[in-house]
Amino acid sequence: LPAQVAFTPYAPEPGSTCRLREYYDQTAQMCCSKCSPGQHAKVFCTKTSDTVCDSCEDSTYTQLWNWVPECLSCGSRCSSDQVETQACTREQNRICTCRPGWYCALSKQEGCRLCAPLRKCRPGFGVARPGTETSDVVCKPCAPGTFSNTTSSTDICRPHQICNVVAIPGNASMDAVCTSTSPTRSMAPGAVHLPQPVSTRSQHTQPTPEPSTAPSTSFLLPMGPSPPAEGSTGD
């Protein structure tokens, strides 16, 4: 004969556990129903009656199947340096991430607690390691033969133009100036020259070694959020 399906609440067999989306109530000593995401336990089960669930109130949520007596409060509104990438609903917390041009200096379980503006490299320095969602820009002096004349969190050091006749030699913060109407060859502006140090002056005392691994020149895509712990160990 097929085993009978037990309806909650029920007393589990000795040594067995409650089924999926059920929990063991110590007081009633019964397996009882959990509440679905977006709800919480309004009345706990007894030996004769199952858990009574109720919807979360505004600005509160539960993300998992649970038997918590109160829903969790959604986080505070996003600050001016953040954008709300996930709204507060009955089933999920608000998630705030840093707005463009900022990075997360102090993260929390979901989203960001503290955003900071991305570092801007001053003239003579270029972006050696771009900023990501969670890390700042790293600036390095432009290598000999390259320059940056901007203050920017994205600009890398660019090669000096090559002149037939040089009017003013380039340095780390200025392109070469040619006397002729056009240079013999001007490096494509899109050419990637990550700064291996240079100086803000034109003389250098050492050759520039290549970095062992070239840093990425693009921003990383944001990572997906991870769910917070709740009063439940999952499904």
Epitope: R119, R122, S173, Q196, V198, S199
Partner: antibody, heavy 119, light 106 residues
């Protein structure tokens, strides 16, 4: 917190060399360049040069080009400044300072190392 | 190299006074000018960078301004702990400190 801790005072004879160290902590050593600045007794501040610990590249003030060598050991997060052919007018306090390459400059300094050059 | 001429070289003032120190660059340095405070036996301390920006933790009585190639550090109301030597520093084209201004108690 960010700290730059320099080696102790030195007394040297004219013609000798001195090597001053600057140990960094509290930040990623290779993400910042290190400047060296000196100050003779009762005088102003004088920029000597910088080193990028990441690649070992340097830039020296013209005045010191022939006598100064700046190096770094990333394994111990330490920058070094060696000045050779010392003269009595090299007697000074030598400072290291970090620089992130943004408009924010030299935001953390070592405590200074007094180098006395005397026969 | 760009030269930085700082004036005055010394200055006597009283607590509560408003004080200004000026630095003039021999060439255009954009806004890449910083101000440092140094007390006897201590390392310099960054007060202002990029002409106007107050370093974290520095009291708001310190401010920086610019008119052409003239840069000014202003202390709006001198406090006892402000008596020290002040240096300007240009970092637009090479690196160069001004000669310093010793601020003494009158």
């Amino acid at each position: 917190q960010v700290q730059l801790v320099q080696s102790g005072a030195e007394v040297k004879k004219p013609g000798a060399s001195v090597k001053v160290s600057c140990k960094a902590s509290g930040y990623t050593f290779t993400d910042y360049i290190i400047h060296w600045v000196r100050q003779a007794p009762g005088q102003g501040l004088e920029w000597m040069g910088w080193i990028d610990p990441d690649y070992g590249n340097t830039d020296y003030a013209d005045k010191f080009k022939k006598r100064v060598t700046m190096t770094a050991d990333t394994s111990i997060s330490t920058a070094f400044m060696e000045l050779s052919r010392l003269r009595s007018d090299d007697t000074a306090v030598y400072y290291c300072a970090r620089d992130e390459g943004s408009p924010l400059v030299m935001d953390a300094w070592g405590q200074g190392t007094l180098v006395t050059v005397s026969s | 190299d760009i030269q930085m001429t700082q004036s005055p070289s010394s200055l006597s003032a009283s607590v509560g006074d408003r004080v200004t120190i000026t630095c003039n660059g021999s060439q255009n340095i954009d806004n890449y000018l910083a101000w440092f405070q140094q007390k006897p036996g201590k390392a310099p301390k960054l007060l202002i960078y990029s002409t106007y920006s107050l370093q974290t933790g520095v009291p708001s009585r310190f401010s920086g301004s610019r008119s052409g190639t003239d840069f000014t550090l202003t202390i709006s109301s001198l406090q006892p702990e402000d008596f020290a030597t002040y240096f300007c520093f240009q970092y637009n084209n090479g690196y160069m400190f001004g000669g310093g201004t010793k601020l003494e108690l009158k």
